[in-house]
């Protein structure tokens, strides 16, 4: 293990399209991988008229955009599909939306997932 790096060994798993995708609907996903590859957790969700709908959660392949992120935070401004990734066991259990705006002060929109 690299000092200061959070190893991801398992992530919260959820798939809204589990029947079509032939997966489980919910659970814990173990994240295996090559020694030289990092694994991350992720969450994707939609905001439909103020209601949070989780699309998928699980393990995410080695991705520099996820390195050293202990919290799962989406920073893009009003995406159609929200996405965040992080490092550390079950770090995708909670995810949040903090849009990076140039002028206005960013507002916190923490999200506690409640799978249906």
């Amino acid at each position: 293990a690299i000092l200061g790096r959070s190893e991801t060994q398992e992530c919260l798993f959820f798939n809204a399209n589990w029947e079509k995708d032939r997966t489980n609907q919910t659970g814990v996903e173990p994240c295996y991988g090559d020694k030289d590859k990092r694994r991350h957790c992720f969450a994707t969700w939609k905001n439909i008229s103020g209601s949070i709908e989780i699309v998928k959660q699980g393990c995410w392949l080695d991705d520099i955009n996820c390195y050293d992120r202990t919290d799962c935070v989406e920073k893009k401004d009003s995406p159609e599909v929200y996405f965040c990734c992080c490092e550390g066991n079950m770090c995708n259990e909670k995810f949040s939306y903090f849009p990076e705006m140039e002028v206005t002060q960013p507002t916190s929109n923490p999200v506690t997932p409640k799978p249906p």
């Epitope: 079509k20 996903e29 694994r39 992720f42 393990c59 995410w60 392949l61 955009n65 599909v81 996405f83």
Partner: antibody, heavy 120, light 107 residues
């Protein structure tokens, strides 16, 4: 090394069936989904569906529903794709492709392709 | 189904040129996008996954960017072995779909 080896070229008559095999080696066969993609001459890539080798469950593109059957034999680490009621438009190269275990599920290893020609 | 639209359908370029290919999804797919390279008579080869992550063994002159609906594949300095057809593909929802392809030809 990780490898997918497909069966040889086939020539079939319209209305017949074809069964293409894809033998996996160099990794744990049951840990990775296998997808099938085809490519008609001079055309782009078309996704057909996938099989989950561990349990055998499948999901097919609507276009092929009722005509395609994907199966697997875990004892030989082989997946099969059978396409029935063949027509001339099914003339294509058929590829099997292993999909990474985790999101966003890229197709990281491909077979060499099997040419299927449908002609009367 | 999610439609993937690639442009241009073909591009003529010289060795050393910078080449940019775009791919647009008909609806948001977050970062569930991969890019493949295919040479005549060969199987496709994975170049980029997760919109911007380089697959092991792929030269660093290839790069990907984008998120949501708009994506780009860039070859920073075209090499002789890069003349091929490139496809984008979404894996966000079934059925998985490919772009129509972009053929990179020698000028």
């Amino acid at each position: 090394q990780v490898q997918l080896v497909q069966s040889g070229a086939e020539v079939k008559k319209p209305g017949a069936s074809v069964k293409v095999s894809c033998k996996a080696s160099g990794y744990t066969f049951t840990s990775y989904r296998m997808h099938w993609v085809r490519q008609a001459p001079g055309q782009g890539l078309e996704w057909m569906g996938f099989i989950v080798p561990s349990g055998g469950s499948t999901s097919y593109a609507q276009k092929f529903q009722g005509r395609v059957t994907m199966t697997r034999d875990t004892s030989t680490s082989t997946v099969y794709m059978e396409l029935s009621s063949l027509r001339s438009e099914d003339t294509a190269v058929y590829y099997c492709a292993r999909v990474s275990r985790y999101a966003p599920e890229p197709m990281d290893v491909w077979g060499q392709g099997t040419t299927v020609t449908v002609s009367s | 189904d999610i439609q993937m639209t690639q442009s241009p359908s073909s591009v003529s370029a010289s060795v050393g040129d910078r080449v940019t290919i775009t791919c647009r999804a008909s609806q948001g797919i977050s970062r569930w996008l991969a890019w493949y390279q295919q040479k005549p008579g060969k199987a496709p080869k994975l170049l980029i996954y997760a919109a911007s992550s380089l697959q092991s063994g792929v030269p660093s002159r290839f790069s990907g960017s984008g998120s949501g609906t708009d994506f780009t594949l860039t070859i920073s300095s075209l090499q002789p072995e890069d003349f091929a057809t490139y496809y984008c593909q979404q894996a966000f929802s079934h059925p998985w779909t490919f772009g129509g392809g972009t053929k990179v030809e020698i000028k």
